[in-house]
């Protein structure tokens, strides 16, 4: 039975040209995390593997910085970056946990962070 929950930064907004940290936390499980994938819709942004470290997809290499921790920092944001982002935790023996973050990139300087929420 999968008992874990993923806490994410929830719905967030940021200014065009700025940067944002995407973070997820897996809790309430003793399962061992072996890999975390970060995806935007159907595109792979980055992988953090317990044994091999980070791999950044070539198409995002100029705009993605690993960290803090298992999080991901997106830089030089454009309005095209608006959308859903997913952190996919591969664990043993539980299996896969997925967290969702919605990012809105704003033209104006009115960028506020939303509340955190949990996904079972």
């Amino acid at each position: 039975m999968m008992t874990g929950t993923i806490e994410t930064t929830g719905n967030i907004s940021a200014e065009k040209g700025g940067s944002i940290i995407l973070q997820c936390h897996l809790s309430s499980t003793t399962a061992q995390v072996t890999q975390v994938n970060w995806e935007q819709q159907d595109q792979l942004l980055a992988i953090c593997n317990a044994d091999l470290g980070w791999h950044i997809s070539p198409s995002f290499k100029d705009r993605v910085a690993p960290g803090p921790g298992l999080g991901l920092t997106l830089q030089s944001l454009t309005v095209n970056d608006t959308g859903e982002y997913f952190c996919i935790y591969h664990t043993y023996p539980d299996g896969t946990y997925t967290g969702r973050i919605f990012l809105e990139v704003l033209e104006s300087s009115v960028a506020e962070h939303g509340a955190r929420f949990q996904i079972p």
Epitope: E7, I21, H25, L26, S27, A50, L52, G53, W54, H55, I56, K61, D62, V64, A65, P66, G67, P68, G69, L70, T73, Q75
Partner: antibody, heavy 117, light 108 residues
Amino acid sequence: QAYLQQSGAELVRSGASVKMSCKASGYTFTSYNMHWVKQTPGQGLEWIGKIFPGNGFTDYNQKFRDKATLTADTSSSTAYMQISSLTSEDSAVYFCTREGWLSLGYWGQGTTLTVSS
Amino acid sequence: DIVLTQSPAIMAASLGQKVTMTCSASSSVNSTYFHWYQQKSGASPKTMIHRSSNLASGVPAHFSGSGSGTSDSLTISSVEADDDATYYCHQWSGYPFTFGAGTKLELK
């Protein structure tokens, strides 16, 4: 097994700059963040910043943004930190430390910097 | 910045004694990003506990960690001679990463 070898102790005059190195071996240099930490008797351990050698992206502690510059040479698997406009406040032991899966798991032996007036 | 306050600053213990040191954060830190390091005189820090309660590889079982939110603790169930060192808590929940000022464990 990851191993970090730091450059030797430095004695440098006030106002000058210094560049210290941290040579990595035993792992894929471009796949892990490299952090730098300052240690003094008065201030304890202070995080200076980190660099991801895979693309050169850096993050700095605001306190050190105008003081330290982090770079990495992937061909030699070496990370560097340059400290500019040296003062006595910069006298310290500086560690490079590789980010592991979820902690700073590997540390260099430290480089002692002494700034003389 | 998240400020980490460690207590006590110095503690003296006898061999076999149980000791607990604490680390309080100025704002909430997810346990995933709470760590403890041991530093012996003249040496580099060494990871003892990561993710608040997980023992790092090679760390003896008489060490343990626990906590959540704004408080974390490191416990040594039975102090050994080799435990004489300074212990630092550390967070990397957000930038800048910060360390506590350390707890120095001395043997009586």
